[in-house]
Structure formats: C-alpha cells, structure tokens
Interface confidence: medium
C-alpha cells in the first residue's frame, strides 16, 4: 500500500554540544502531512517525547530548558502522516559539557611553530580520564578522540602534528571524558592559539578565524601523524 515515508531531519539549536544548565531545542522536520512527531532517546523507554506539529506541520519542537546529564545521549525522531510512521531520522548526539573540571591544553615545544616542523598538543586533566578530545574551532569535523584501551585511565593525551602546515593554524580546545558516557564531557580547556609561520612550501596564508568562509582545508578532520605516544591510548576518528 505504501512506500516508506521519507525520513525526517533532526538537529539541535544552538548546537549539539551544550554546556550544563543551558537550554537547547531539538527540531524534527518531516513533511507537510505530518500529524505528530516522536522523539526517541537511546536506552530510554520509547517514545521519549511526542509533540504535535507546528504550522505548517512540517516540523516539531522538543525543548530542553536546562541541560543536565539526563538529556545527554543519542536521539532519533519519527513523524506520522495519514498513511503511517516514517523511517527514523539519522541520529543526533547531544553532548553535555561541564560534567568534569576543565583540562589544560598546551603546545610542545611552543604554540608558535614553523611550517614543516612538528608540534604536539598536550591535553592534561587533574583526575585520570579515559577519553580526550581535541577540537578545532570552525572545523566541520572537529573531534579527534584519544581513548584509553582496557579502561586504563590517563592524566593526559598527546596529539602530535607533523609536518605542520598553515592548515593546522587556529584555535584549539580540549575536553576530557569517561568512557561510560562519551556524551558527558568536561568543561572546555582554555583556548590555545596555534600560530604557524614561515610556510615557504605553502605560500597560502594561515586562514583567519574572524570570518567563517566556504569549506576549505581547515574544514577537514585534524590528521596528526606518528604513533600514539601513550601505549594505553588508541586514536579514534569521529
């Protein structure tokens, strides 16, 4: 009788990484014929929430007035039209920051680095953690995970970059987390500005960060080279 209904689109505003206590709105956009929307949260009884559509019926709003650990997780949404339920949306991972104290981010040997040389970004936490994330501002794919194996916890993770090019320049932050929930992150570290100079083999100037432009090399995932310095840590690309 019916072909599968198109899957809805699921997103969060102002974003999917939310500080503890801040508000977030989850939006599910279906079709103009939708009668109701359902939001399911992984490992929670379904449906996690139901909403009637907003006019003109092609989307629904799910409001979280104050972000807490309970809201962090993986969500999918569905809509129901006169002919039945849609396919599930692609998942939305809602991450809460502020669950743990902030780590410290530093650059070795220095945040001022000559193009072609090596630099290592070091993320250190006060208490032992098993996951560290390095995030570059304004990158389309900002997350690089270093996760410890066998639950061994570490106080720090190293993110080596070699050879450095102008693409690596920019503002970085890091987070730490426990493996039992990678949806709960620490407060962000203070920002670290990595400045790349003397790019003789790469005449392109280091991209400015004041204006977000069309996708370019800086929007690619950070790809450090070399072996992972801590034997207990394994690199994960997200």
């Amino acid at each position: 009788q019916a072909g599968p209904l198109p899957k809805p689109t699921l997103w969060a505003e102002p974003g999917s990484v939310i500080s503890w206590g801040n508000s977030v709105t989850i939006w599910c956009q279906g079709t103009l014929e939708a009668r109701e929307y359902r939001l399911d949260k992984e490992e929670s009884p379904a449906p996690w929430d139901r909403q009637n559509p907003l006019e003109p019926k092609n989307k629904a709003r799910f409001s979280i007035p104050s972000m807490t650990e309970d809201y962090a997780g993986r969500y999918r949404c569905y809509y129901r039209s006169p002919v039945g339920w849609s396919q599930p949306s692609d998942p939305l991972e809602l991450v809460m920051t502020g669950a743990y104290s902030k780590p410290t981010l530093s650059a070795l040997p220095s945040p001022l680095v000559t193009s072609g040389k090596s630099v290592t970004l070091l993320c250190q936490s006060r208490s032992p953690m098993d996951t560290f994330l390095l995030i570059k501002e304004r990158a389309a794919h900002p997350l690089l995970h270093l996760r410890s194996e066998h639950g061994a916890q570490q106080h720090q993770a190293e993110f080596p970059m070699s050879p450095v090019t102008s693409v690596h320049g920019g503002t970085y932050r890091c987070f730490s987390s426990h493996g039992f929930s990678h949806y709960l992150l620490s407060h962000p570290s203070d920002p670290l500005e990595l400045i790349v100079s003397g790019s003789l083999e790469d005449p392109r100037p280091s991209p400015t960060r004041s204006v977000s432009t069309a996708a370019g090399p800086e929007d690619q995932p950070l790809m450090p080279t070399g072996s992972v310095p801590h034997s207990g840590l394994r690199r994960h690309w997200e």
């Epitope: 009788q1 103009l32 006169p82 039945g84």
Partner: antibody, heavy 118, light 112 residues
Framework: QVQLKESGPVLVAPSQSLSITCTVS????????VHWVRQPPGKGLEWLGV???????NYNSTLMSRLTINKDNSKSQVFLRMNSLQTDDTAIYYC????????????WGQGTTLTVSS | DVVMTQTPLTLSVTIGQPASISCRSS???????????LNWLFQRPGQSPKRLIY???KLDSGVPDRFTGSGSGTDFTLKISRVEAEDLGVYYC?????????FGSGTKLEIK
C-alpha cells in the same frame, strides 16, 4: 481561486491503459497533496491514491499493481496512469486537493468520465 | 480497511423539516493526535463532491449553519435543521484517520 480540472480519454478498450491529467491552479503542488477518487455509475466513491507534496505516493491496495501517480510541479499537473483496464473501471475519475489541517479534501475537480468498452 | 456504514440509504423529507443521517465506522476514528478525521461530503446530481464538514463538526466556508456535525469514536451524525431545495442530493461520510481512506455508501436526500 483554487481549481482542479481533469482531462483524459472518454473511451478505452479493455486491457488497454489510460492516463488522466489533473491540472491545478490557485495552489502549488510543492505545498499540497492531490488525491484521486473514482465513482462508478450510480455508485459510491472509492479512494484510489495520493501523491504527497514531497512526491511520495500511496495507493489503494486493491489497485496498486495497476496504478501509478506522478506529477510535474512546474506545470501544476498530476497524472494518474492505470493499466489493464476492465469494464468495471468505468467511472468518473476525480482529483481532489488535500487540506492538511483537517486531513480532508477541500476542493474537487469536476471529474472526467471514462468508459471501458470494446 | 475501516468500513463506513451510512443509514438510511434514502431519506425522504419535506422542505422546511429537519433531517438526520447516521454514519458508523467499524473502528474508532479518534486518532492518537487527539483529532477525529471524520468528514461529510455533499454531491448534487451531475456535479462533483463538495466538502461540507471536516473534523466531525467544522463547517467548510460557505456552508449554511443549518448543517451540524456531531459524534465521536465510531458514531457520527449529520443534521440539517430545516431542509431546503438546494440540499437535495447524496451525502457521504468518509474517514481519514486510518489508511486507506474509506467512504460510506452515501445517503440520498429526496423530497417527500
């Protein structure tokens, strides 16, 4: 104002196919669904199928193997194609606009009469 | 599929008198969104159907207020407080709650 107008063949031989066009005005096919309903002579109404605003289609299960509905948004036209016609497919064929608030048909075309006969 | 049963099949009424048509569905038409998608259509001889009532009781624009729709669940009624000559024709109920949409067999309103 909203209008729907069906046009198609008047007489078709058994086992042949038919295509009926519904030309709409006063609304956009990108925002509204269109249904097809038929009415055999002296009988009641039978829902045939729908093409939703996004282009997805659904059909009456008893007829879906013989029905195809598609549309051209830019020409404001919806097409009903039906194959392997039999005499009991003789009917007035209507297109109707879907109104989303009440999920009902708020405007109907004037209908086109199809006779299946050898 | 949901079966819609209308009674009576024919209704003979004197002009100026009330009329009532019943429509019964084989399943409840109350949707999980809280709405009941029960509609009434009117068709004059030789013309296309016209929407009278949707969501049980909401009158389409231009429909005189002598028409009222009521009911819930599986039992619904269309009432005309005073029949006028222009009301003669066939009345259909149909449901949009369950897929596929289904129509009643129609009630013919004629002059006594």
């Amino acid at each position: 104002q909203v209008q729907l107008k069906e046009s198609g063949p008047v007489l078709v031989a058994p086992s042949q196919s038919l295509s009926i066009t519904c030309t709409v005005s006063g609304f956009s096919l990108t925002n509204s669904a269109v249904h097809w309903v038929r009415q055999p002579p002296g009988k009641g109404l039978e829902w045939l199928g729908v093409i939703w605003a996004g282009g997805n289609t659904n059909y009456n299960s008893t007829l879906m193997s013989r029905l195809t509905i598609n549309k051209d948004n830019s020409k404001s036209q919806v097409f009903l194609r039906m194959n392997s016609l039999q005499t009991d497919d003789t009917a007035i064929y209507y297109c109707a606009k879907h109104e989303t608030y009440g999920d009902s048909f708020d405007y109907w075309g004037q209908g086109t009469t199809l006779t299946v006969s050898s | 599929d949901v079966v819609m049963t209308q009674t009576p099949l024919t209704l003979s009424v004197t002009i100026g008198q009330p009329a009532s048509i019943s429509c019964r569905s084989s399943q409840s038409l109350l949707d999980s969104d809280g709405k009941t998608y029960l509609n009434w259509l009117f068709q004059r001889p030789g013309q296309s159907p016209k929407r009278l009532i949707y969501l049980v009781s909401k009158l389409d624009s231009g429909v005189p207020d002598r028409f009222t729709g009521s009911g819930s669940g599986t039992d619904f009624t269309l009432k005309i407080s005073r029949v006028e000559a222009e009301d003669l024709g066939v009345y259909y109920c149909w449901q949009g709650t369950h897929f596929p949409f289904t129509f009643g067999s129609g009630t013919k309103l004629e002059i006594k």
